[in-house]
Interface confidence: low
């Protein structure tokens, strides 16, 4: 009698590794013998697609060799024409070994930057993917951790950073090992020791001692007065990434001695500075012809501001210059506290370098004037709003006297470093942080953002520099 | 040495796709940005997209958002530019060039190697 | 979107002359400018970063300059391997302009 098809053995879950053989078994009882048909994701399977075997009238399905694409529910429907057609299905799931398939790379970068190392994987179960560095698994903190995608993210590198990786990627089935890979932390240029400055005798004998540290080591060259050292012997020693110069001299007129540590990351250098006078008792006293003498700041309203010991120009034209230059300071810095929290402090490091400007010793002492670019920095990033507010106030008269057009200085008239970059004076203390600048606009108008206003800077490292540093 | 070899251009019809490849080798992409800059014959320098990969930050010129999408392999060090929807205007030599830095510090840096570049026509 | 617009766009000079190429930015924008210069058939290269720099291996008779919104490229004495098309190029965070650029020829 004829018989509606009935599968006896329904599809069940099949498991199967990945180049190895899958059969899926469809029993079926009915009378005429029913016609089979396989499908993948409700995809028919084609009878002649080589990549399967279709036996036994249809009733056992093979996949000859497993690929991790395979993955899927897999059904068959038996149907003879009697009664109705009648389904089976079930899901092939692909068991694979762990694999990495985009392994980590050497990576070179700087100090206080970001490093991704990369270590992407397939396999089922998902593996989990674990670091070594060396020889012992990586511990994740605050600063290092593994990613979803089995990356490796390290803030804020630090030296010991520095080493060899690898990444391993683990299910049930196994092991993988990408192969080692090197991160190697390079570190800008900075001044660990920086030269003293001494005041002696004309004739004597002084050693400037100036130490640094970075990755590569840096250079140590000298500077004297803006010029490379034309005199004087350099002695230096290299231990543990730490360059020690010793700059001998033999004293015959007061100078700027400037020790420049330089190191290369690619194709760029990073740099830092630190400089000493060296001045000659009894030489520096106002001469009838000089408009003014060298001599260390001992004021207070500046004495944040500018660099410790530094040299600065006290100009004779007043009777008491020290107290006469004090006093224009003091005045315009009460005007100061008013402005906003971005223009206070990049105002009080222009004010005090304008008024006390920086000195260059010699037969005649020469008063060294900000450079233009800090100015304009100040100008038109820093204080725009409260620049136009001053120069209107001027223009209308409101001062009550002129006292505060000496420490506001025109920009324009100032030299540019571009000219030369002895002739004029950076400014240090433009300290600022990134909750106040949310005032300037963004670069760009693609996307928000709010960025730091990138104030023109020449090659040296950073534009905050610490007091016992000269930018000169 | 760092170098950058870019490869992927020919002849295209408008409305057709290609696939702009650009192997860096002397550094790493992960640690750079890597840029497209086009250059139409007789014409200047026009900027096409950047990405900094360690960030996986991207951007895209106003002329070619929606069509072009540039991308990084930072196994294979390489980077490319997958061109959608191509017009004549598209026409050009595609440069791939790199700066250091993620996109926060590599503007200052300037775009400090570049690769020969690989000619893009767009023609029926 | 900010724009770069330079000028001169060409410009004819002798062995030795002074030149000067200026970028002007359309509103106000940090100091991530650079200078480049290119030959036919060639690729640009990188003379000048952070609108002042002077990138390593460039003779130093290029440099760069900035003024508020202008920006100067400047060769203080022209020599033959100078006659060249430069490009000033401007980047913020999210995006990256170019200028018209400017053709040097001999005159």
């Known amino acids: 009698l004829p018989k509606a098809p009935v599968i006896t053995t329904p599809l069940e879950t099949v498991d199967a590794l990945v180049e190895e053989v899958a059969t899926f078994m469809c029993a079926v009882e009915s009378y005429p013998q029913p016609e089979i048909s396989w499908t993948r994701n409700k995809i028919l399977i084609k009878l002649f697609d080589t990549r399967y075997s279709i036996r036994e009238n249809g009733q056992l399905l093979t996949i000859l060799s497993v690929e991790d694409s395979d993955d899927g529910i897999y059904c068959c429907t038996a149907n003879n024409g009697v009664g109705g057609a009648v389904e089976s299905c079930g899901a092939l799931q692909v068991k694979m070994k762990p694999k990495i398939t985009r392994p980590p790379i050497n990576v070179k970068i700087i100090e206080g930057l970001k490093a991704v190392l990369p270590c992407t994987t397939m396999g089922n179960p998902k593996p989990s993917v674990s670091w070594i560095k060396g020889d012992s698994p990586l511990r994740e903190n605050s600063r290092i951790a593994v990613l979803e995608s089995g990356s490796l993210r390290i803030h804020n590198v630090q030296k010991e950073d520095a080493g060899q990786y690898r990444c391993v990627a683990k299910n049930s089935l196994g092991t993988a090992y990408s192969k080692v890979v090197k991160l190697e932390v390079e570190v800008f240029a900075r001044i660990l020791r920086a030269p003293e400055s001494h005041n002696v005798t004309f004739g004597s004998f002084v050693t400037l001692h100036c130490t640094a540290t970075g990755i590569p080591v840096p250079t140590i060259t000298w500077i004297e007065n803006g010029n490379a050292v034309s005199s004087g012997s350099i002695q230096e020693s290299v231990k543990d990434r730490v360059i020690d110069s010793r700059l001998q001299l033999f004293i015959t007129k007061p100078g700027l001695y400037t020790c420049i540590a330089t190191n290369k990351h690619g194709e760029k250098f990073s740099t830092a500075k630190a400089a000493a006078t060296i001045s000659i008792a009894e030489w520096s006293k106002p001469q009838k012809d000089n408009k003014g003498y060298c001599a260390q700041y001992r004021g207070e309203v500046c004495n944040a501001v500018l660099a410790k010991d530094a040299l600065v120009f006290l100009n004779t034209s007043y009777a008491d210059p020290e107290e006469a230059q004090e006093l224009l300071v003091h005045t315009a810095w009460n005007e100061l506290k008013v402005v906003s929290p971005v223009c206070r402090p990049a105002a009080e490091a222009l004010l005090c370098n304008h008024i006390f400007q920086e000195c260059s010793p010699g037969v005649v002492p020469t008063p060294i004037p900000i450079c233009r670019e800090y100015c304009l920095a100040v100008k038109e990033l820093f204080c725009a709003k409260e620049w136009l507010v001053m120069e209107e106030k001027t223009h209308r008269g409101l001062y009550r006297s002129e006292m505060h057009l000496l420490s506001v200085p025109e920009c324009s008239k100032l030299p540019s470093m571009h000219w030369d970059p002895t002739a004029c004076a950076r400014l240090p203390h433009l300290d600022y942080n990134k909750e106040n600048l949310k005032t300037f606009p963004p670069m760009t108008s693609s996307k928000p953002s709010v960025d730091i206003p990138n104030l023109p800077s020449s090659s040296s490292s950073s534009f905050s520099v610490s007091p016992t540093y000269s930018m000169t | 040495e760092v170098q950058l070899v870019e490869s992927g251009g020919g002849l295209v019809q408008p409305g057709g796709s290609l696939r702009l490849s650009c192997a860096a080798s002397?550094?790493?992409?992960?640690?750079?940005?890597i840029h497209w800059v086009r250059q139409a014959p007789g014409k200047g320098l026009e900027w096409v997209a950047s990405?900094?990969?360690?960030?996986?930050?991207?951007s895209y010129a106003d002329s070619v958002k929606g069509r072009f999408t540039i991308s990084a392999d930072t196994s294979k060090n390489t980077a490319y530019l997958q061109m959608n929807s191509l017009r004549a205007e598209d026409t050009a030599v595609y440069y791939c060039?790199?700066?250091?830095?993620?996109?926060?510090?590599?503007?200052?840096?300037?775009?400090?190697?570049w690769g020969q570049g690989t000619l893009v026509t767009v023609s029926s | 979107d900010i724009q770069m617009t330079q000028s001169p766009s060409s410009l004819s000079a002798s062995v030795g002359d002074r030149v000067t190429i200026t970028c002007r930015a359309s509103?106000?924008?940090?100091?991530?400018v650079a200078w480049y210069q290119q030959k036919p058939g060639k690729a640009p290269k990188l003379l000048i970063y952070?609108?002042?720099s002077l990138y390593s291996g460039v003779p130093s008779r290029f440099s760069g300059s900035r003024s508020g919104t202008d920006f100067t490229l400047t060769i203080s004495s022209l020599q033959p391997e100078d006659f060249a098309t430069y490009y000033c190029?401007?980047?913020?965070?999210?995006?990256?302009?170019f200028g018209q650029g400017t053709k040097v020829e001999i005159k």
């Open positions: 002397g550094f790493t992409v992960s640690s750079s940005s």
């Open positions: 060039a790199r700066s250091e830095g993620d996109r926060y510090v590599s503007g200052y840096m300037g775009l400090d190697y």
């Open positions: 952070s609108a002042s």
């Open positions: 990405i900094s990969s360690s960030y996986g930050s991207t």
């Open positions: 509103q106000s924008v940090s100091s991530a």
């Open positions: 190029q401007q980047s913020g965070v999210w995006l990256i302009t």
